[in-house]
Amino acid sequence: SEVEYRAEVGQNAYLPCFYTPAAPGNLVPVCWGKGACPVFECGNVVLRTDERDVNYWTSRYWLNGDFRKGDVSLTIENVTLADSGIYCCRIQIPGIMNDEKFNLKLVIKPAKVTPAPTRQRDFTAAFPRMLTTRGHGPAETQTLGSLPDINLTQISTLANELRDSRLANDLRDSGATIRIG
C-alpha cells in the first residue's frame, strides 16, 4: 500500500520522491498530481518538470530540494484538511514501460489547540522557509542561528518540525528513490 505521510493543518507537508540522474544535468521529466498515478502521466497535475526546469506549478506546491540532482520531493505549503489524499510522483524515464510511479498518502491532522501566547509573532516571517532542508544525509544538521523572542509553544513546534524534517532526510534511503543509468 501507499507510504503514509502526516502533517498538521497550517504546516508545510513534505512528500519525498527522488531519482539519480544518469549524469549531472541529464534530467528526466517528472510530474506530481493529486490522486493515484493514472494510466499516463499524472492526473490533476500540481507540478511538472522537464529536462531543464520546473515548467508548471500551482500555488502552494514547490520543489524545495535540488531537483537538478534528482530530488523532486514535493512541499505543500500551509496545508488544509482538503489536501489529504494520495499524490502521484511519476518519473517519466524515456522508453517504453520505463516510468516509475510512486503513490504517497498524505494525512492531514487538525492543528493542536494551544493557549494563546502572550506575545504573538509571525513564525513564518521569523523563519522564512528555514525549516526545510536542501541537503541529504544523517550527518547534516540544521542550525537556527540567533533565535528571536518566541514562546514555548513555538519552540516545541519548531523542535517537532526539525525532527520531522530530519526524518524526511532519512527517508531518502527508504522512500521513493530510483537510480537511472
Epitope: S1, A36, V39, F40, M97, K101
Partner: antibody, heavy 114, light 107 residues
C-alpha cells in the same frame, strides 16, 4: 464532457488496409492521450496504441509492424490504420481517452471477409 | 505481457443480491487495476481505478479491493441496470492487458 465517435468501413477484404477515424468533441487532441482498443467476437479486449498531445505514438508490440496512428489537429480527429488485415482482425474498434480510459466511443464493428 | 485471469466467465444472480468477480495477475501490478462495465452497443464504462477508487457518479454498491497479484470487484444490492459484462484492466505498465470478461446475468 468529452465525446468520441468512431467511423469507417464495416467490411474490409483480407490483405487490405483498414482505416478508421475517431472524431473528438469537448476536448482538444493537443492535450492528453488518444487510444485505440478493440474487442474481438469472443469478448477479448486488446489495447492497440495511442497518439498523445505532442503527436508521439505507442503501439502494442504485437501489432507494431502493421499499425499506424495519426491525427489531424485542425479537424480534432485521430486515425487508425491497420495494414494487411486478416479475418483475425474482425472486431469492434473503440477510441478512448481519459486518465483511466474514462471516455470511450460506442465502437464501430469491422468484419474482415472476402 | 502481464496476464489477467478473470473469473468466473459468467454468473447469474438475483436482484438485490451480491456478486464478486476476481482478477489474478501473472505478476505484481502494484494496485494498478481498473474495472469496467460494458453493455452491447456502448463503450465500456469506467467504474473503479487504482483497485478501490470509485469514479465520480458511480454508486457505492460497487467496490474493489486487493493487492499484489490478487484483486476482486463486488456489486451489492444488484439492480436491473447492473446486468452487463465486466472487465478488469491492469495498467502497471504500457503493455495494458484486460481480463477476459465476466457476463453477469439475471437469475
Amino acid at each position: 464532457e468529452v465525446q468520441l465517435q468512431e467511423s469507417g468501413p464495416s467490411l474490409v477484404k483480407p490483405s487490405q488496409t483498414l482505416s478508421l477515424t475517431c472524431s473528438v468533441t469537448g476536448d482538444s487532441i493537443t492535450s492528453g492521450y488518444w487510444n485505440w482498443i478493440r474487442k474481438f467476437p469472443g469478448n477479448k479486449l486488446e489495447y492497440m496504441g495511442y497518439i498523445n498531445y505532442s503527436g508521439s505514438t505507442y503501439y502494442n508490440p504485437s501489432l507494431k509492424s502493421r499499425i499506424s496512428i495519426t491525427r489531424d489537429t485542425s479537424k480534432n480527429q485521430y486515425y487508425l490504420q491497420l495494414n494487411s488485415v486478416t479475418t483475425e482482425d474482425t472486431a469492434t474498434y473503440y477510441c478512448a481517452t481519459g486518465n483511466h480510459f474514462d471516455y470511450w466511443g460506442q465502437g464501430t464493428t469491422l468484419t474482415v471477409s472476402s | 505481457d502481464i496476464q489477467m485471469t478473470q473469473s468466473p466467465s459468467s454468473l447469474s444472480a438475483s436482484l438485490g443480491g451480491k456478486v464478486t468477480i476476481t482478477c489474478k495477475a501473472s505478476q505484481d501490478i502494484n494496485k494498478y487495476i481498473a474495472w469496467y462495465q460494458h453493455k452491447p452497443g456502448k463503450g465500456p464504462r469506467l467504474l473503479i481505478h487504482y483497485t478501490s477508487t470509485l469514479q465520480p457518479g458511480i454508486p457505492s454498491r460497487f467496490s474493489g479491493s486487493g493487492s499484489g497479484t490478487d484483486y476482486s470487484f463486488s456489486i451489492s444490492n444488484l439492480e436491473p441496470e447492473d446486468f452487463a459484462t465486466y472487465y478488469c484492466l491492469q495498467y502497471d505498465n504500457l503493455l495494458f492487458t484486460f481480463g477476459s470478461g465476466t457476463k453477469l446475468e439475471i437469475k
